[in-house]
C-alpha cells in the first residue's frame, strides 16, 4: 500500500533569463528511494540514483543543474519553459510517486511564487 | 536478457594500472546510465564511478577522483575503467552496473578481481 505523499513547490512563475529551483519532497513512507526523475511533459530532464548520483540529459546539460538535494534548479529561462514538470520518485517496495510543477516563465519583471500544495 | 560481463581485472603492483571492461548486451546502451562499483573482503559495496548518455555525464568517487576515468563505447556497448596510480586499498572485486534510466532497475555482472601488492 502506498502511504506516501509528494509536496511541491506547486505553481510557480519565474522572470525570462533567470533562474528557478524545482522541488519536490516525498514524505509519510519509509520507502527507500532508489531514483528520482524529472521530466518536461514527455522530456527526460535528469535522474537522481541513489547509487549513480546525478546525471543530466544532454540537451539539457546547459541550462538544467542538479539540487539542492533531490531539487533541480534551471538556468537562463526562456518563454519556452512555461510548462509542467513532473518529478517521479522510484522506491522500493512502494513504488513510483509522481510530482506536478506547473512553471510558467514571465516577460515582464513581476513573477511571484505559487504557494505550496500537496499531491496524494 | 540483459548480461554484463567484466574483465581485465589481476594483479598488479603498487603505482601500476589496469584497464577494467564491460560488455553489455540485451539492452538499447543509450537507455541505461553504467557504473563501477567495489566491494573488498569484509566491507559493503561502494560505489566507485558512472556514465551515462553517451559519456556527457561522469561521476567518481572522491576516493577515485583523477586516478580513474570512466569511458564507454556505443558501437561496442562496453563501459571502460581506467585505473592509474593503483593503491593496495584499491583492492577489491569490480562489479559493472546497468541502471535503466527511465526507473532504476538494475543490473549487475558477476565481477573481476583486482589485486594491488604492495
Known amino acids: 500500500m502506498m502511504t506516501g505523499t509528494i509536496e511541491t513547490t506547486g505553481n510557480i512563475s519565474a522572470e525570462k533569463g533567470g533562474s528557478i529551483i524545482l522541488q519536490c519532497h516525498l514524505s509519510s513512507t519509509t520507502a527507500q528511494v532508489t531514483q528520482v526523475n524529472w521530466e518536461q511533459q514527455d522530456q527526460l530532464l535528469a535522474i537522481c540514483n541513489a547509487d549513480l548520483g546525478w546525471h543530466i540529459s544532454p540537451s539539457f546539460k546547459d541550462r538544467v543543474a542538479p539540487g539542492p538535494g533531490l531539487g533541480l534548479t534551471l538556468q537562463s529561462l526562456t518563454v519556452n519553459d512555461t510548462g509542467e514538470y513532473f518529478c517521479i520518485y522510484h522506491t522500493y517496495p512502494d513504488g513510483t510517486y509522481t510530482g506536478r510543477i506547473f512553471l510558467e516563465v514571465l516577460e515582464s519583471s513581476v513573477a511571484e511564487h505559487g504557494a505550496r500544495f500537496q499531491i496524494p | 536478457e540483459v548480461q554484463l560481463v567484466e574483465s581485465g581485472g589481476g594483479l598488479v603492483q603498487a603505482g601500476g594500472s589496469l584497464r577494467l571492461s564491460c560488455a553489455a548486451s540485451?539492452?538499447?546502451?543509450?537507455?541505461?546510465?553504467m557504473g563501477w562499483f567495489r566491494q573488498a573482503p569484509g566491507k559493503e559495496r561502494e560505489f566507485v564511478a558512472a556514465?551515462?548518455?553517451?559519456?556527457?555525464?561522469?561521476n567518481y568517487a572522491d576516493s577515485v577522483k583523477g586516478r580513474f576515468t570512466i569511458s564507454a563505447d556505443n558501437a561496442k556497448n562496453t563501459v571502460y575503467l581506467q585505473m592509474n596510480s593503483l593503491k593496495p586499498e584499491d583492492t577489491a572485486v569490480y562489479y559493472c552496473?546497468?541502471?535503466?534510466?527511465?526507473?532504476?532497475?538494475?543490473?549487475w555482472g558477476q565481477g573481476t578481481q583486482v589485486t594491488v601488492s604492495s
Open positions: 552496473a546497468a541502471v535503466r534510466i527511465t526507473d532504476g532497475r538494475d543490473y
Open positions: 540485451g539492452f538499447i546502451f543509450d537507455s541505461y546510465a
Open positions: 556514465i551515462s548518455w553517451g559519456g556527457s555525464n561522469t
